[in-house]
């Protein structure tokens, strides 16, 4: 992520004194962390990342906002309306639907802060719940009662 | 979430002047936001939330840390080693594996802040990547080359 101060008084302040420091932990990138580079098609691969091998395969779509933390979010997009056959991985089985799994993720937006008299006092972080689609899941269709 | 000040100088400060304010948006709870109340078993239901209808069904396990934002995270736990048959919703199909989908989520930990001379200056938020399991996905097994 590009760096931006998170609680920054309008007067300059040494970074060592920032009330909010960001430190990124080096963690090996996990499969959903970035888009799938394999060909995007409605088939379940026998290798590659989880979203390619799934019988409800999906791709990732980047959602970037430089005034938000995290700045980069990825939304899953299903590649098939139905699930792919476990037998072949290449033809659809209409007995199953490929459905998006949604999640309300906590994100933080950078907003101007205002003091008691409405003066600009730097930036504040505003917490929001942001809907992201995490993956596509093969489900049995709902039975309408 | 319970409220705790996020950038709090050691001296008391009016909440309106807090550099970092949290505001929660009322968003309708989505399926993965809380544990499944349906019976936990290795079967794909024809109703209920996505994690019950999936042919790779899962339950949610609460992970609570009051010094972290979000304080509550849920980890998916697969209920079956293989996928459930689309035909019956109850028999396992050994041609598919139920695998966890992992994600490195950005979280924030509350840590004591120290000033230039090592004095305690309140609390800082430390950004970390935290591995969470989002869901269980039905995949074709990897073919070993």
């Amino acid at each position: 992520y590009s760096h931006w101060p998170s609680c920054c008084p309008s007067k300059g302040q040494d970074t060592s004194e920032e009330l909010l420091r960001w430190s990124t932990v080096p963690v090996p990138p996990l499969e959903p962390a970035r888009p799938n580079r394999h060909p995007e098609s409605c088939r379940a691969s026998e290798d590659g990342p989880l979203n390619s091998r799934a019988i409800s395969p999906w791709r990732y779509e980047l959602d970037r906002d430089l005034n938000r933390l995290p700045q980069d979010l990825y939304h899953a997009r299903c590649l098939c309306p139905h699930c792919v056959s476990l037998q072949t991985g290449s033809h659809m089985d209409p007995r199953g639907n490929s459905e998006l799994l949604y999640h309300n993720q906590t994100v933080f937006y950078r907003r101007p802060c205002h003091g008691e008299k409405g003066t600009h006092k730097g930036y504040c972080l505003e917490r929001r719940l942001y809907r992201v689609s995490l993956a596509c899941v093969c489900v049995r269709p709902r039975v309408m009662g | 979430y319970s409220h705790w000040p996020s950038c709090c100088p050691s001296k008391g400060q009016d909440t309106s002047e807090e550099l970092l304010r949290w505001s929660t948006v009322p968003v309708p709870p989505l399926e993965p936001a809380r544990p499944n109340r349906h019976p936990e078993s290795c079967r794909a239901s024809e109703d209920g939330p996505l994690n019950s209808r999936a042919i790779s069904p899962w339950r949610y396990e609460l992970d609570r840390d009051l010094n972290r934002l979000p304080q509550d995270l849920y980890h998916a736990r697969c209920l079956c080693p293989h996928c459930v048959s689309l035909q019956t919703g109850s028999h396992m199909d050994p041609r598919g594996n139920s695998e966890l989908l992992y994600h490195n989520q950005t979280v924030f930990y509350r840590r004591p802040c120290h000033g230039e001379k090592g004095t305690h200056k309140g609390y800082c938020l430390e950004r970390r990547l935290y591995r969470v399991s989002l869901a269980c996905v039905c995949v074709r097994p990897r073919v070993m080359g």
């Epitope: 056959s85 037998q87 072949t88 209409p94 007995r95 | 048959s85 035909q87 028999h91």
Partner: antibody
Framework: QVQLQESGPGLVKPSETLSLTCTVS????????WSWIRQPPGKGLEWIGY???????NYNPSLKSRVTISVDTSKNQFSLKLSSVTAADTAVYYC???????????????WGQGTLVTVSS | DIVMTQSPDSLAVFLGERATINCRSS????????????LAWYQQKPGQPPKLLIY???SRESGVPDRFSGSGSGTDFTLTINSLQAEDVAVYYC?????????FGGGTKVEIK
Amino acid sequence: QVQLQESGPGLVKPSETLSLTCTVSGASISNYYWSWIRQPPGKGLEWIGYIFYSGNTNYNPSLKSRVTISVDTSKNQFSLKLSSVTAADTAVYYCARVRFSDYELNWFDPWGQGTLVTVSS
Amino acid sequence: DIVMTQSPDSLAVFLGERATINCRSSQSVFLGSNNKNYLAWYQQKPGQPPKLLIYWASSRESGVPDRFSGSGSGTDFTLTINSLQAEDVAVYYCQQYFITPLTFGGGTKVEIK
């Protein structure tokens, strides 16, 4: 009665591309899955891959990088291309219909008579 | 891939006697949800293409003489030819269609003793 007939060159040079066509009669190619299977002289059977009229294909991983199966619904034909051939690709090549039920592929029936392709310079 | 192993490689039987061919899969080809074994048997006579005899491990294809029967489940299967006839001289193959890649056994040659 469904009948299949393979056609194509009987001799291919090493490193070149083997090309065969299967002509289907007695059934519409659009209603079934169609497959290629080969049999080296005096040896067993090896499945190469299948195709559906929509173009949906599935190939044997052992040959995947070299195989292309295509379909021509207007001619009621499907074809096999196998690139970069070697002597090990010398075989009788059969085309066959794949039975399909309950959203799954089943057995092969019927088969074409087969055509021998020899890879040699 | 599922490896199909046939035994014996060849078999010589007197006319009118029983011939038994075995086929073993490296993993189960039985699916509990439909109670079926995804296994077929073929007969191949010299200079001819294979001909389907048995599907779902034990269902005889129409037109196939009833002296041919298939049995077994999971990983172990048998093709039995009761009262072997001269026209049964051929190579017999088992094939799994449980999962792609679809695979065949190495074949068993049946001859008259």
